[in-house]
């Protein structure tokens, strides 16, 4: 297993609709054709794998398990979007990238993106 640098933004604020997007960029030492991206959430004394996708370079990412994630890839960048977030989902979201094929296997883990989620205030009742 060889180490690889992964960069991601330090902080992202989710939209009022509970959507957060960030870029996960990895310094690929070679020409990988198969890449696996996993997003992990670290909070509340748990580490949770939020979503994972394996993709062939040039193809779109496919996530399993009713995923709350969507994503696209462009070169060594993965644009990740996490949906359906609530205030309780605030936490550190870590991007993990694995270059699966061809060998050698490379692994890179980012420092994490702190995603802040603020639940929208309910609209006051209107007489109009």
């Amino acid at each position: 297993c060889k180490a690889m640098h992964v960069a991601q933004p330090a902080v992202v604020l989710a939209s009022s609709r509970g959507i957060a997007s960030f870029v996960c960029e990895y310094a690929s030492p070679g020409k990988a054709t198969e890449v696996r991206v996993t997003v992990l959430r670290q909070a509340d004394s748990q580490v949770t794998e939020v979503c994972a996708a394996t993709y062939m370079m040039g193809n779109e990412l496919t996530f399993l398990d009713d995923s709350i994630c969507t994503g696209t890839s462009s070169g060594n960048q993965v644009n990740l979007t996490i949906q359906g977030l609530r205030a309780m989902d605030t936490g550190l979201y870590i991007c993990k990238v694995e270059l699966m094929y061809p060998p050698p296997y490379y692994l890179g883990i980012g420092n994490g993106t702190q995603i802040y989620v603020i639940d929208p205030e309910p609209c006051p009742d209107s007489d109009f």
């Epitope: 939020v50 979503c51 399993l64 009713d66 995923s67 977030l85």
Partner: nanobody
Framework: EVQLVESEGGLVQPGGSLRLSCSAS????????MGWFRQAPGKEREFVAS????????SSADSVKGRFTISRDNAKNTVYLQMNSLKPEDTALYYC???????????????????WGQGTQVTVSS
């Protein structure tokens, strides 16, 4: 309704290992995340680990990270909890539970789970 039946626990020495299994019958097992929780005497039920419907995603409590591994076999309708390097503080009643979804960010909360096993006692003592 889903029936969840845990394997027998037991008495294990500190540093020892034990594998729990949980068999499910009823609704389609492969559609739902599964989890393990535990409850020590006089304490609240706490999250241990969970695994997504397809088995690709997992979540675990910091207290068991690196020691406990959750896995599942959808062909056998069974979820497993491999417990290594057991400590006296792991002593508890262990419950298997079925999540109402394939996966979510709230898999560590008890309210996400609809069906529960009866529990199996694990005691770690010399």
């Amino acid at each position: 309704e889903v029936q969840l039946v845990e394997s027998e626990g037991g008495l294990v020495q500190p540093g020892g290992s034990l594998r729990l299994s949980c068999s499910a019958s009823g609704r389609t097992f492969a559609n739902n995340a599964m989890g393990w929780f535990r409850q020590a005497p006089g304490k609240e039920r706490e999250f241990v680990a969970s695994i997504s419907a397809s088995g690709t995603l997992t979540s675990s409590a910091d207290s068991v990270k690196g020691r406990f591994t959750i896995s599942r076999d959808n062909a056998k309708n069974t979820v497993y909890l491999q417990m290594n390097s057991l400590k006296p503080e792991d002593t508890a009643l262990y419950y298997c539970a079925r999540n109402r979804r394939a996966w979510s960010l709230s898999v560590h909360t008890t309210r996400e789970y609809d069906d529960w096993g009866q529990g199996t006692q694990v005691t770690v003592s010399s």
